[in-house]
């Protein structure tokens, strides 16, 4: 049985330029997270394998940075990085929990930044 | 060219423990990880497990932990896997397979296989 | 782990037909799929990456579609050599997992 819940950073703004970063946290479970996959519209940004370490996807490497945690940081943002985000845990024993996070890269210097939420 | 060639048929009993190995050459043996697949007589493929040869870090399969321990030789271009307190259902041909991609863990199809490693546990 | 289905198990085809297997995952592995060949005494031979991408040397009757979680590998016209078990394996989730296989028979 599932227990565990997902808790992410929610819907998040960013200046263009600028950088934000993606933070997911599980918990309420025991399961072992073997590997976090962080997704952009089915398109794969990075991963995290709890023995292999960060992988980060070629098309991506110039602007996304690994962490903090098992976060994502994106860097040199632009418009086009406005959109969902999924961070996927892959856990042992209970399976696959997914969060949703919410992007918009604004062009206006006065864009509201979400709260940087850091795993404890 | 790309060659893995492993070690021998191997008989064992109940309890024991074998070490297959895999020898690479044709290709920088440290820019792909390895991964590990075995085949039951007559059985589908089960992954096992990975190392990445230039750091030796290893990612088992949930089902062989405690039991696999992966190592790497860089002077000799080689690949280990040892499976311990071996039972009857470990009877198999034991894979090693070159992950495709340099430096990298993924994507990594396997895209050069051993030819195979024979375990036969039995008392 | 993410499970791998293919079917049919067993297919009998006569030579110069058409043969379509089948895999499903259990969760979606995007187009992170790839297919092997494997004869008896032989070990595998990779077929197909990316889901739909022939690998270097393979005979363009071998094609493969799909994304997600349903995928087919296609032999356009059946030569005497692919009487063979062929896999799927998905390679985005540790554990990387195969399907059980299909064999292709002649018919």
């Known amino acids: 049985m599932m227990t565990g819940t997902i808790e992410t950073t929610g819907n998040i703004s960013a200046e263009k330029g600028g950088s934000i970063i993606l933070q997911c946290h599980l918990s309420s479970t025991t399961a072992q997270v073997t590997q976090v996959n962080w997704e952009q519209q089915d398109q794969l940004l990075a991963i995290c394998n709890a023995d292999l370490g960060w992988h980060i996807s070629p098309s991506f490497k110039d602007r996304v940075a690994p962490g903090p945690g098992l976060g994502l940081t994106l860097q040199s943002l632009t418009v086009n990085d406005t959109g969902e985000y999924f961070c996927i845990y892959h856990t042992y024993p209970d399976g696959t929990y997914t969060g949703r996070i919410f992007l918009e890269v604004l062009e206006s210097s006065v864009a509201e930044h979400g709260a940087r939420f850091q795993i404890p | 060219q790309v060659q893995l060639v492993q070690s021998g048929a191997e008989v064992k009993k109940p309890g024991a423990s074998v070490k297959v190995s895999c020898k690479a050459s044709?290709?920088?043996?440290?820019?792909?990880?390895m991964g590990w697949v075995r085949q039951a007589p007559g059985q589908g493929l089960e992954w096992m497990g990975v190392i990445n040869p230039s750091m030796g870090a290893t990612s088992y399969a949930q089902k062989f932990q405690g039991r696999v321990t992966m190592t790497r030789d860089t002077s000799t271009s080689t690949v280990y896997m040892e499976l311990s307190s071996l039972r009857s259902e470990d009877t198999a041909v034991y894979y090693c397979?070159?992950?495709?991609?340099?430096?990298?863990?993924?994507?990594?199809?396997?895209?050069?296989w051993g030819q195979g490693t024979m375990v036969t546990v039995s008392s | 782990e993410i499970v791998m289905t293919q079917s049919p198990a067993t297919l009998s085809v006569s030579p110069g037909e058409r043969a379509t297997l089948s895999c499903r995952a259990s969760q979606s592995v995007s187009s992170n799929l790839a297919w092997y060949q494997q004869k008896p005494g032989q070990a595998p031979r990779h077929l197909i990456y990316?889901?739909?991408t022939r690998a270097t040397g393979i005979p363009a009757r071998f094609s493969g579609s799909g994304s997600g979680t349903e995928f087919t590998l296609t032999i356009s016209s059946l030569q005497s050599e692919d009487f063979a078990v062929y896999y799927c394996q998905q390679y985005i989730v540790f554990p990387w997992t195969f399907g059980g296989g299909t064999k292709v028979e002649i018919k």
């Open positions: 397979a070159r992950l495709h991609v340099s430096g990298s863990y993924y994507p990594a199809y396997l895209d050069y």
């Open positions: 990316g889901a739909s």
């Open positions: 044709g290709y920088t043996f440290t820019s792909h990880y």
